[in-house]
C-alpha cells in the first residue's frame, strides 16, 4: 500500500537525520531503485547519495567497533605488561637497595671502592631485562673480571700491578675460581630467570602490538558493499524493522575479517607459550628467586674471595710472577669480617602468584579473539535478530537465511556468498604480525628451555620461523663487550608500550 | 690507536646552553668510561662527570649537577656533555677523557673544546 | 672531598737535575693516585698511576712515590721538554674525582 508509512520513507528520513545526513536528501515517498549498486534493485527510499553515504557509515562504523574490540584487547594487554614489568623491575631495585644499604657495613672499603662496578651491573641487568641486545653471560663474565682486578689490587695494596700483571691475572681467573661458585651460579640462574621474564613481558608487548597494527588493517571495497547490504539495506528498501540474521552477519563478517581469523593459529601459539613459561617464575631458578636475590650471589663471592685470597695470591704468583712489591706501601689487608648474607631464597611476596593466575586466566579468555570476532561482532554491534527465522533481513529480503556458514580463515571464503574474498591475495600486514607472533613464539620457547634466542648459534636444530634474528621491527642492535669492537643499544621495542628509560644520575 | 676527537670552540651568551661533542676511534666505545674535565684561563683541572657509554649512567660533580647532562650515541661512538645556564665563570677549556681501565685513571684525552661565555 | 694540595706553586731546576713535587690528600687516598703532564695549548697527559706505576710510553726517569698520603713525582735528569705544569689526581673517591692545583716545573 503506497499510502502506509512504509511506503512514505518517513522512517528512513528518521533513521538517515539521526546519522547527520541532510533530510533533503530523502525522497517523500519510494522512488524505483534502478539507480542503487548495493542494495537491491526494487522500490526504495535511497536515492544513489543516500546509498553512497550509508555504505561509507556502514564501513565507518564496523571499523569503529573492530577497534574497539581490539582497544579493549590492548588494554588488557598493556595493564598486564605494565604489571608485571612493574614487578619485575621491583625486584631488581629492591636487589640493588638493599646491596646499597648492607654492603658498606658488610664489605667497607670492598664495596665503597667498587661502587661503580655494581651499579653497573644493575643497570646492565635492568638494559638486559628491557630488552637490549646483549649477552648476558657475557655482561656477568664480564664484570667478575673487572671486580677481580680490582679487588685483587685492594686486597694486596703492597704490591705493584701493572696492566700487564691485571691481564696476566685475568687470564687465570677461570681456572682459578676466585669467587667460589657464586659466578656460576648467578650465570646458570639469572640466565634462565632474566630469559623467562623478559622474553614474558616482550610477548605481552609484541602481542599486544600485532592487536594495534592489526586494527589498523583497513577493510576492502568488497567487505564495504557487504556490510552496507547487511546493515543499511534493509532501509532503503523499505524493512527498517528487519533485522540481520545471525548467520547472514557471520558470513559477512567472516569474510571481511578472512585475514584476521588467519591470525588464530599463532596467535594460540603464543599465548599457549607465554602460559607455559610461568612456570620458570618459580623454584631455585625461578625469576622471584633470583632477580630478587642477585645481591646475595654478589655478597657470597666476596666472602669467597676473603676466604681463598691466600690460595689465590699463591696460584697468581705461580701463573703471572713475582710481582714488585712497593716499598712504601703498605702491608697486606687485614681479613675482614665476612659480609653476613640474607637468605638466598626471597619468600615470595604472593604478588608473583597472583599476577601469574590473573594473567594465565585473561590469556585463555582471548585465545579465540581472531575466529570468535565476527561472532562477537555481530551479536555485540550489530542489533542481531533473535533467532535465524522467516523474519530477519537476509540481504535481499525479509526472510529465512539458506547459505551454510563459512569456515574461518582466507582459505575457507572461497564460496562466502556474501562477499567476495580473493583468497590468492593474502594482506600482507596480517601475514607480517603472524610472522612476529611466529618470532616471539620461537623465542618463548627458547626461553622455556633456558636459552637466549638472540645468541643461539646458527647450528640449531633449524625449527622455527622467522626472520632468523629474532629481531622486532627491523630495530635490531648489535651485541657487545669490550673486546668486541660494535655498539649496543636498548631495543625500547623490544617492550611496546613502555619508553626506555634514560641512564640513571647519581651523584 | 685511540683518538677522541672534539668540537670545535664555542662563543656563548651569559644563560645560553652549550654541547660539546666527543666522537671516539680506536678502541670498544661502550666498554670504557668517559669523562669530562674542564680548565679555567690560567688555573687547574675540574672533574665535571663520567658516563658509561654501555648504560648511558652517568654521575655528575655535585658542583654541576643542576646545569649538565651527558649523553651518548652508540651508533657514532659520541658522548656529548651539554651545559646550560652559562655564566662568565664557565669559560673554560673542556676535554673529555677515557679510563685507562675500569679505575678513574685518565689516560686519554680529547684535544680540549674553548667555550667563551660573554655577553 | 679530598682536597689535593700540591707544592711548591712552581719549581725552578736546572736540566740534567732531579726535580721533586709534592702531593699531599687531605685524608687516604690509598695508592690511588695519578699524576699528568701538561703543556701551554695541550692537554693533559698521563705520566703516572696507582702512585708509582708508570704509563705506557712514559721514561723511566719519571717516578711515583707515597708514604700515607703524601705522595711525591720525581722527574730525574730533567730535559728542555719536561717544563710543563703537572697536576696529582686521586681517584679513591668515587664519584669525586679531584685534582691538586698544579706544580709549574720551568727548567733554568
Known amino acids: 500500500d503506497p499510502a502506509s508509512k512504509s511506503r512514505s520513507c518517513g522512517e528512513v528520513r528518521q533513521i538517515y537525520g539521526a546519522k547527520g545526513f541532510s533530510l533533503s536528501d530523502v525522497p517523500q515517498a519510494e522512488i524505483s531503485g534502478e539507480h542503487l549498486r548495493i542494495c537491491p534493485q526494487g522500490y526504495t527510499c535511497c536515492t544513489s547519495e543516500m546509498e553512497e553515504n550509508l555504505a561509507n557509515r556502514s564501513h565507518a562504523e564496523l571499523e569503529t567497533a573492530l577497534r574497539d574490540s581490539s582497544r579493549v584487547l590492548q588494554a588488557m594487554l598493556a595493564t598486564q605488561l605494565r604489571s608485571f614489568d612493574d614487578h619485575f623491575q621491583h625486584l631488581l631495585n629492591d636487589s640493588e637497595r638493599t646491596l646499597q644499604a648492607t654492603f658498606p657495613g658488610a664489605f667497607g672499603e670492598l664495596y665503597t671502592q667498587n661502587a661503580r662496578a655494581f651499579r653497573d651491573l644493575y643497570s646492565e641487568l635492568r638494559l638486559y631485562y628491557r630488552g637490549a641486545n646483549l649477552h648476558l653471560e657475557e655482561t656477568l663474565a664480564e664484570f667478575w673480571a673487572r671486580l677481580l682486578e680490582r679487588l685483587f689490587k685492594q686486597l694486596h695494596p703492597q704490591l705493584l700491578l701493572p696492566d700487564d700483571y691485571l691481564d696476566c691475572l685475568g687470564k687465570q681467573a677461570e681456572a682459578l675460581r676466585p669467587f667460589g661458585e657464586a659466578p656460576r651460579e648467578l650465570r646458570l640462574r639469572a640466565t634462565r630467570a632474566f630469559v623467562a621474564a623478559r622474553s614474558f613481558v616482550q610477548g605481552l608487548g609484541v602481542a599486544s602490538d600485532v592487536v594495534r597494527k592489526v586494527a589498523q588493517v583497513p577493510l576492502g571495497p568488497e567487505c564495504s558493499r557487504a556490510v552496507m547490504k547487511l546493515v543499511y539495506c534493509a532501509h532503503c528498501l523499505g524493512v527498517p524493522g528487519a533485522r540481520p540474521c545471525p548467520d547472514y552477519c557471520r558470513n559477512v563478517l567472516k569474510g571481511c575479517l578472512a585475514n584476521q581469523a588467519d591470525l588464530d593459529a599463532e596467535w594460540r601459539n603464543l599465548l599457549d607459550s607465554m602460559v607455559l613459561i610461568t612456570d620458570k617464575f618459580w623454584g631455585t631458578s625461578g625469576v622471584e628467586s633470583v632477580i630478587g636475590s642477585v645481591h646475595t650471589w654478589l655478597a657470597e663471592a666476596i666472602n669467597a674471595l676473603q676466604d681463598n685470597r691466600d690460595t689465590l695470591t699463591a696460584k697468581v704468583i705461580q701463573g703471572c710472577g713475582n710481582p714488585k712489591v712497593n716499598p712504601q706501601g703498605p702491608g697486606p689487608e687485614e681479613k675482614r669480617r665476612r659480609g653476613k648474607l640474607a637468605p638466598r631464597e626471597r619468600p615470595p611476596s604472593g604478588t608473583l602468584e597472583k599476577l601469574v593466575s590473573e594473567a594465565k586466566a585473561q590469556l585463555r579468555d582471548v585465545q579465540d579473539f581472531w575466529i570468535s570476532l565476527p561472532g562477537t561482532l555481530c551479536s555485540e554491534k550489530m542489533a542481531l535478530s533473535t533467532a535465524s527465522d522467516d523474519r530477519c533481513w537476509n540481504g535481499m529480503a525479509r526472510g529465512r537465511y539458506l547459505p551454510e556458514v563459512m569456515g574461518d580463515g582466507l582459505a575457507n571464503q572461497i564460496n562466502n556468498p556474501e562477499v567476495e574474498v580473493d583468497i590468492t591475495k593474502p594482506d600482507m600486514t596480517i601475514r607480517q604480525q603472524i610472522m612476529q607472533l611466529k618470532i616471539m613464539t620461537n623465542r618463548l620457547r627458547s626461553a622455556y628451555n633456558g636459552n637466549d634466542v638472540d645468541f643461539q648459534d646458527a647450528s640449531d636444530d633449524g625449527s622455527g620461523s622467522g626472520s632468523g634474528d629474532g629481531c622486532l621491527d627491523d630495530l635490531c642492535s648489535r651485541k657487545v663487550s669490550r673486546k668486541s669492537s660494535s655498539s649496543r643499544t636498548p631495543l625500547t621495542h623490544a617492550l611496546p608500550g613502555l619508553s626506555e628509560q634514560e641512564g640513571q644520575k647519581t651523584s | 690507536q685511540v683518538q677522541l676527537v672534539q668540537s670545535g670552540a664555542e662563543v656563548k651568551k651569559p644563560g645560553a646552553s652549550v654541547k660539546v661533542s666527543c666522537k671516539a676511534s680506536g678502541y670498544t666505545f661502550t666498554g670504557y668510561y668517559m669523562h669530562w674535565v674542564r680548565q679555567a684561563p690560567g688555573q687547574g683541572l675540574e672533574w665535571m662527570g663520567e658516563i658509561n657509554p654501555s648504560t648511558g649512567d652517568t654521575t655528575y660533580n655535585q658542583k654541576f649537577k643542576a646545569r649538565v647532562t651527558m649523553t651518548r650515541d652508540t651508533s657514532t661512538s659520541t658522548v656529548y656533555m651539554e651545559l646550560s645556564s652559562l655564566r662568565s665563570e664557565d669559560t673554560a677549556v673542556y676535554y673529555c677523557?677515557?679510563?685507562?681501565?675500569?679505575?678513574?685513571?685518565?689516560?686519554?684525552w680529547g684535544q680540549g673544546t674553548l667555550v667563551t661565555v660573554s655577553s | 672531598d679530598v682536597v689535593m694540595t700540591q707544592s711548591p706553586a712552581t719549581l725552578s731546576v736546572p736540566p740534567g737535575d732531579r726535580a721533586t713535587l709534592s702531593c699531599r690528600a687531605s685524608?687516604?687516598?690509598?695508592?690511588?693516585l695519578a699524576w699528568y703532564q701538561q703543556k701551554p695549548g695541550q692537554a693533559p697527559k698521563l705520566l703516572i698511576y696507582?702512585?708509582?706505576t708508570r704509563a705506557t710510553g712514559i721514561p723511566a726517569r719519571f717516578s711515583g712515590s707515597w708514604s700515607g698520603t703524601e705522595f711525591t713525582l720525581t722527574v730525574s735528569s730533567l730535559q728542555s721538554e719536561d717544563s710543563a705544569v703537572y697536576y696529582c689526581q686521586q681517584y679513591n673517591d668515587w664519584p669525586r674525582y679531584t685534582f691538586g692545583q698544579g706544580t709549574k716545573l720551568e727548567i733554568k
Open positions: 677523557a677515557r679510563e685507562k681501565r675500569d679505575d678513574g685513571v685518565f689516560a686519554y
Open positions: 685524608q687516604s687516598v690509598s695508592s690511588r
Open positions: 696507582g702512585a708509582s
